[in-house]
């Protein structure tokens, strides 16, 4: 889409509500394999004071534990600071608050730096619609198609959702 466009005026609050994880990608495949630290699944999100609060589901011992995390705002509108398995610079990469959200994180843990990307959608029945956008963002940030893992219902703790 070339040219200039009018944009909406809403804020982070538009991201609030239920989300479903659809795909993960990383330059360190172990991080997003089963039992990897970043094989986690979004449950819901809310925004307050410019910070993002997320409830995530973490597979543990055959069950899923819900954990609350807060990503704190920075001077850059699409960047947040998150502490989870080390320090993360979390970036919103592409967003349609009614449909999908793509974020990526630069994780620093024990002097090791990793890149993890995450695609989430509002409506799981439309997940295929947004995989091309995820692949495009992954390309932008230096991840390849073969570094993407598309999740199945079994993967994403569906049974743990309210």
């Amino acid at each position: 889409q070339e040219g200039n466009h009018e944009e909406p005026q809403g804020g982070l609050e538009e991201l609030s509500g239920r989300w479903h994880s659809v795909a993960l990608a990383s330059n360190k495949s172990d991080l997003i394999k089963p039992w990897g630290h970043f094989r986690v699944f979004i449950h819901s999100m809310s925004a307050k004071d410019g910070n993002l609060h997320g409830d995530i589901l973490i597979p543990q011992d055959g069950q899923c534990e819900k954990v609350s995390l807060t990503a704190f705002k920075t001077a850059t509108s699409n960047k947040f600071d998150l502490e989870y398995w080390g320090h993360n610079d979390l970036y919103l990469a592409e967003v349609d608050p009614k449909s999908y959200l793509i974020l990526y994180m630069i994780n620093q843990y024990n002097d090791d730096t990793s890149l993890v990307a995450h695609l989430m959608v509002r409506d799981l029945s439309r997940q295929q619609d947004f995989l091309p956008a995820f692949e495009s963002v992954c390309e932008d940030i230096g991840l390849h198609k073969d570094q993407i893992v598309v999740l199945s219902d079994d993967d994403r703790c569906q049974g743990s959702r309210d």
């Epitope: 944009e7 909406p8 699409n78 970036y91 919103l92 592409e94 349609d96 932008d140 940030i141």
Partner: nanobody, 117 residues
């Protein structure tokens, strides 16, 4: 309405340097990718360099080692420092930004860079 405004173009002798700048207006959730493309007469627009929010860069092979892209996320600005310019670098240089909002792509009006031998 999103606008990208370029500056810094002009004429220079081969071997010289120029620095292009681009300021983007505030956008919903900001920009994930910013960068520069160029178009020489009779040719298609081509990538010069891009930089993502986290600082990762991508350069066209023809400019690697000569051009450096940088960015100030808080100010929505992107710069392109061009050294060791040669005649083949003559083109209109377009600022590019990919917004977080819907992944929309935006372009500046372009700034002329002319390198003479």
């Amino acid at each position: 309405q999103v606008q990208l405004v370029e500056s810094g173009g002009g004429g220079v002798q081969a071997g010289g340097s120029l620095r292009l700048s681009c300021v983007a207006s505030q956008s919903h959730f900001g920009y994930n990718v910013m960068g520069w493309y160029r178009q020489a007469p009779g040719r298609q627009r081509e990538l010069v360099a891009t930089i993502i929010s986290s600082g990762g860069t991508n350069y066209a092979d023809s400019v690697k080692g000569r051009f450096t892209i940088s960015r100030d996320n808080a100010k929505n600005t992107v710069h392109l420092s061009m050294d060791s310019l040669n005649v083949e670098d003559t083109a209109v240089y377009f600022c590019y930004a990919k917004g977080v909002w819907l992944g929309r792509e935006y372009w500046g009006q372009g700034t002329q860079v002319t390198v003479s031998s």
